[in-house]
Interface confidence: medium
């Protein structure tokens, strides 16, 4: 569809509320340091301009592309050079280079203060005083901290945020009603952001073929009754949606996502029996529901795959005629039969199958050469199965906090050059796999665990790319998307690492430790643990456990003392000396 005015087209399609929300998200994700009021001003100017184009599509500048309009608007920010440094150079470029330049300057770890949650009464007053501003502030604060957040999904989070306040600010016990809802939104939001970041990394670093392969596998698991051509249609449309959102084209992305939801709901019969309850919901909820929908039941009469992909004499002929389609059909057929496998495992199997065909179809006797290809899958399948089994046993034995600590030690030994805050963040999140996945039935454990780990390890890769310090991390992150997790799992103690010099300051603690929340206390202790391992990478589990137990006892003792600060000042150096002796 060609429209005289793209901005008018999107305004009409999306409606004013969603249009304004998406433009605010787009601007906040590009200019992450700009004050809220500045962004609101820019959004209002764009919205007023869009309205003039709706009234007259031939009006001046209405024919310009959205990138041109939005880029021009961003480049009017007066403090661009002072606030963003070299990002201001983007404004000297022409489209499409200017937009690419803005994208490259998105910061996954912006230097922004953690969001502090005010008192419930303060929040409710702000909500009632100016609901629109309150919700815009939410979009702004989330978007600037998560510059790749899936924009149409962020509108859904904002709608839930609004509903929570509308309900709970009327409740007798506002806090009891609101705080659990806000906690849930925060946790779900962080998970959603991390999942989308992997999709964007997949598209940007490995190309749309990698993303399409992921989508074929995942959608074939979800919709095992759908034809291959149907799955392919959904994959093509979904790839367009995510390519747009990852590229900053948020209006097009939201519009196309709505079209995809409409298509799925109009074609439920050829997709899945599970879509019905999603399709009765309003747009934002419907799209979210469709994205999260459970796997449909597998057809009962699926024949063996071996007939078409191993035993057939036409395997090489079919492969040669259209490699990507044949491999796509193989992946579709394998995935729809294996909802119990992780998507990453399915992609490894497809890769192994492709490698075998590349080798065997050039051999003297191709059929003889590829006859045992499915046997070669066995070790690939067993590796993640064993990993999940061992780690779930460890999680059940230790509990979440100590399981996180085991992972902190494991990963610090593998890649000690990585910054301590990154190791703590990533290992804590890796450790959450236990509570998330280990309680599930056997058939759901691997897809839950390995695909979650892929998301968490992508965060490590994204942070490391910004400040590269380890060749091992770079290698695991860049060589193969599907083999990232096995690559990290296979890393051993870095023998080349020169231990970090001991710094007593790192292990000096104060009375403020006692007022921290349980989570903040854990982070402090885990930070110390990482520093210990960096100082003594060859320390045994027993040595580290001894030091950490002493640390916990020391903190507990001083937090019970009358003069806490004096206790920390006196007991701290003793703890440090005892720790050094224990690790000598």
């Amino acid at each position: 569809d060609t429209h005289k005015s793209e901005v008018a087209h999107r305004f009409k399609d999306l409606g004013e509320e969603h249009f304004k929300g998406l433009v605010l998200v787009a601007f906040s994700q590009y200019l992450q340091q700009c004050p809220f009021e500045e962004h609101v001003k820019l959004v209002n100017e764009v919205t007023e301009f869009a309205k003039t184009c709706v009234a007259d599509e031939s009006a001046e500048n209405c024919d310009k592309s959205l990138h041109t309009l939005f880029g021009d608007k961003l480049c009017t920010v007066a403090t661009l050079r002072e606030t963003y440094g070299e990002m201001a150079d983007c404004c000297a470029k022409q489209e499409p280079e200017r937009n690419e330049c803005f994208l490259q300057h998105k910061d996954d770890n912006p230097n922004l203060p953690p969001l502090v949650r005010p008192e419930v009464d303060v929040m409710c007053t702000a909500f009632h005083d100016n609901e629109a501003t309150f919700l815009k502030k939410y979009l702004y604060e989330v978007a600037r901290r998560h510059p790749y957040f899936y924009a149409p999904e962020l509108l859904f989070f904002a709608a839930r945020y609004k509903a929570a306040f509308a309900e709970c600010c009327q409740a007798a016990d506002k806090a009891a009603c609101l705080l659990p809802k806000l906690d849930e939104l925060r946790d779900e939001g962080k998970a959603s952001s991390a999942k989308q970041r992997l999709k964007c990394a997949s598209l940007q670093k490995f190309g749309d073929r990698a993303f399409k392969a992921w989508a074929v596998a995942r959608l074939s698991q979800k919709f095992p009754k759908a034809e291959f051509a149907e799955v392919s249609k959904l994959v093509t449309d979904l790839t367009k949606v995510h390519t747009e959102c990852c590229h900053g084209d948020l209006l097009e992305c939201a519009d196309d996502r709505a079209d995809l939801a409409k298509y799925m709901c109009e074609n439920q019969d050829s997709i899945s029996s599970k879509l019905k309850e999603c399709c009765d919901k309003p747009l934002l909820e419907k799209s979210h529901c469709l994205a999260e929908v459970e796997n449909d039941e597998m057809p009962a009469d699926l024949p063996s795959l071996a007939a078409d992909y191993v035993e057939s004499k036409d395997v090489c002929k079919n492969y040669a005629e259209a490699k990507d389609v044949f491999l796509g059909m193989f992946l579709y057929e394998y995935a729809r039969r294996h909802p119990d496998y992780s998507v990453m495992l399915l992609l490894r199997l497809a890769k192994a199958y492709e490698a075998t065909l590349e080798k065997c179809c050039a051999a003297a006797d191709p059929h003889e050469c590829y006859a045992k290809v499915f046997d070669e899958f066995q070790p690939l399948v067993e590796e993640p199965q064993n990993l999940v089994k061992q780690n779930c046993e460890l999680f059940e034995q230790l509990g979440e906090y100590k399981f996180q600590n085991a992972l902190l030690v494991r990963y610090t030994k593998k890649v000690p050059q990585v910054s301590t805050p990154t190791l703590v963040e990533v290992s804590r999140n890796l450790g959450k796999v236990g509570a998330k996945c280990c309680k599930l039935p056997e058939a759901k454990r691997m897809p839950c665990a390995e695909d979650y780990l892929s998301v968490v390890l992508n965060r490590l890769c994204v942070l490391h790319e910004k400040t590269p310090v380890s060749e091992k991390v770079t290698k695991c992150c860049t060589e193969s998307l599907v083999n990232r997790r096995p690559c990290f799992s296979a890393l051993e103690l870095d023998e080349a690492y020169v231990p970090k010099a001991f710094n007593a300051e790192t292990f000096t603690f104060h009375a403020d430790m006692c007022t921290l929340s349980e989570k903040e206390k854990q982070v402090k202790k885990q930070t110390a643990l990482v520093e210990l391992v960096k100082h003594k990478p060859k320390a045994t589990k027993e040595q580290l456990k001894g030091v950490m137990d002493n640390f916990a006892a020391f903190v507990e003792k001083c937090c019970k003392a009358d003069d806490k600060e004096a206790c920390f000042a006196e007991e701290g150096p003793k703890f440090v000396a005892a720790s050094q002796a224990a690790l000598a």
Epitope: E227, A229, D269, D308, N318
Partner: nanobody, 119 residues
Framework: EVQLLESGGGLVQPGGSLRLSCAAS????????MLWVRQAPGKGLEWVSV????????YYADSVKGRFTISRDNSKNTLYLQMNSLRAEDTAVYYC????????????WGQGTLVTVSS
């Protein structure tokens, strides 16, 4: 009863063009993915192109990519194949077929239309 009727074949010189049509009846065309397959003299069936029920996406065999275009008109229950830059090796009987629910097999196909590329 499913019926697929191909037309538009004929003799054409190398580098020339042809447009094949396939009229479908007896099934719900607009919910069916369709494809073109061909059989060269003395050879097996080779699939040429697939089109989803909605018109996108489309897929092509590597041997025809960039030269052939598959399309459909659901209001007329008709499938098309525009063939440009024809080569001698494109000589074959072309069949339109209803795409299968899976695997490289075809549920129904027509009687075919012969395309001969020769100078």
């Amino acid at each position: 009863e499913v019926q697929l009727l191909e037309s538009g074949g004929g003799l054409v010189q190398p580098g020339g063009s042809l447009r094949l049509s396939c009229a479908a009846s007896g099934f719900t065309f607009d919910t069916s993915s369709m494809l073109w397959v061909r059989q060269a003299p003395g050879k097996g069936l080779e699939w040429v192109s697939v089109i989803h029920q909605s018109g996108t996406p489309t897929y092509y065999a590597d041997s025809v990519k960039g030269r052939f275009t598959i399309s459909r008109d659901n209001s007329k229950n008709t499938l098309y194949l525009q063939m440009n830059s024809l080569r001698a090796e494109d000589t074959a009987v072309y069949y339109c077929a209803k795409f299968p629910s899976s695997r490289m097999k075809f549920d129904y196909w027509g009687q075919g239309t012969l395309v001969t590329v020769s100078s």
